[in-house]
Interface confidence: medium
């Protein structure tokens, strides 16, 4: 299905050394607390059946879920990184607010639902895992949306 031209982020969003470093530091600190090594949230299964042109829209869904269901509830943890990274990711989410798919997005929603269920079923350790994969989220957004 074709994508609207709004599914784009400027390259400059991913070329800010300070916030990039803080994002990766946050991910590293959280991953040290993650003991569910069998589950990879952002990986091959997440993108199964999703064309390259649809991946930014998929990552928008993952970003919004991560912000609303993971980062906001865990905002008091992993300081000082969290207080800087969350507003940065929220700005990216805002910039993707007009990103929509023309046509059926059910195949994307299915994959995102699998990620959501995995995080929710793992409980707090699922939230920690999602934070520990913010480096993958960052890189996947970059690869999909610029």
């Amino acid at each position: 299905a074709p994508i609207s031209s709004h599914c784009r982020l400027d390259k400059s969003n991913f070329q800010q050394p300070y916030i990039t470093n803080r994002t990766f530091m946050l991910a590293k600190e959280a991953s040290l607390a993650d003991n569910n090594t069998d589950v990879r949230l952002i990986g091959e299964k997440l993108f199964h059946g999703v064309s390259m042109s649809e991946r930014c829209y998929l990552m928008k869904q993952v970003l919004n879920f991560t912000l609303e269901e993971v980062l906001f509830p865990q905002s008091d943890r992993f300081q000082p990184y969290m207080q800087e990274v969350v507003p940065f990711l929220a700005r990216l989410s805002n910039r993707l607010s007009t990103c929509h798919i023309e046509g059926d997005d059910l195949h994307i929603q299915r994959n995102v639902q699998k990620l959501k269920d995995t995080v929710k079923k793992l409980g707090e350790s699922g939230e920690i895992k999602a934070i520990g994969e913010l480096d993958l989220l960052f890189m996947s957004l970059r690869n999909a949306c610029i």
């Epitope: 069998d38 589950v39 299964k45 059910l106 929603q109 639902q113 699998k114 990620l115 995995t118």
Partner: antibody, heavy 119, light 109 residues
């Protein structure tokens, strides 16, 4: 509450076909795959196949390929498993189960449907 | 397809600890999921992933993994734990089918 409710017990003759239904509720039907697993009397669990409830794509165990057909009715949020050319060895309890998450967790399961093949 | 191997039967004294194992090549990469099945009932998921319990599953159930072997441990086995236990896992090639181990019949003495 997520529920999978299966159709009632069936008695069939050898060579006949059987169609078992699995009515789902409590979640968005198209977002999850449904698998079928059978269990012969006193035996273990045997995976038969699965269906993508969104687009109807299916995959079957090699053992049942060509003899089993899994379909779905999205408006009825129901999945069906039809097994043809029944033999005595097909006497079993047939279960549907929802695949959850990224790593093949089956939860919940239907209550099971006993299919008896008898002349 | 790939195979998961379980011991057919294991017994444990009431209140003691028992370990049920599942072996297979895919378990070098992925953890097993574990299901409990009581006579005349459908299987129930008791452990998924590294050692995660669905709500309602007692904390006496836990899991571990080493090499190609996954283990389900019941610490302080109760009479109601008497059941068949099955493992399943992803294929290491990430493809279906998704077979189960042959099952282990647990008897609580």
């Amino acid at each position: 509450e997520v529920q999978l409710v299966q159709s009632g017990a069936e008695v069939k003759k050898p060579g006949a076909s059987v169609k078992v239904s699995c009515k789902t509720s409590g979640y968005k039907f198209a977002l999850y795959d449904i698998h079928w697993v059978r269990q012969a009397p006193g035996q273990g669990l045997e995976w038969m196949g699965w269906i993508n409830a969104a687009n109807g794509d299916t995959e079957y165990s090699q053992k049942f390929e060509g003899r089993v057909t899994i379909t779905r009715d999205t408006s009825a949020t129901t999945v069906y498993m039809e097994l043809n050319s029944l033999t005595y060895g097909d006497t079993a309890v047939y279960y549907c189960a929802r695949e959850e998450g990224l790593y093949n967790w089956f939860d919940p399961w239907g209550q099971g449907t006993l299919v008896t093949v008898s002349s | 397809s790939y195979e998961l191997t379980q011991d057919p039967a294991v017994s444990v004294a009431l209140g003691q600890t028992v370990r049920i194992t599942c072996q297979g090549d895919s378990l070098r990469i992925y953890y097993a999921n574990w299901y409990q099945q009581k006579p005349g009932q459908a299987p129930v998921l008791v452990i998924y992933g590294k050692s995660n319990r669905p709500s309602g599953i007692p904390d006496r159930f836990s899991a571990s993994s080493s090499g190609n072997t996954a283990s389900l441990t019941i610490t302080g086995a109760q009479a109601e734990d008497e059941a068949d236990y099955y493992c399943n896992s992803r294929d290491s090639s990430d493809k279906h089918p998704v077979p189960f181990g042959g099952g282990t019949k647990l008897t609580v003495l």
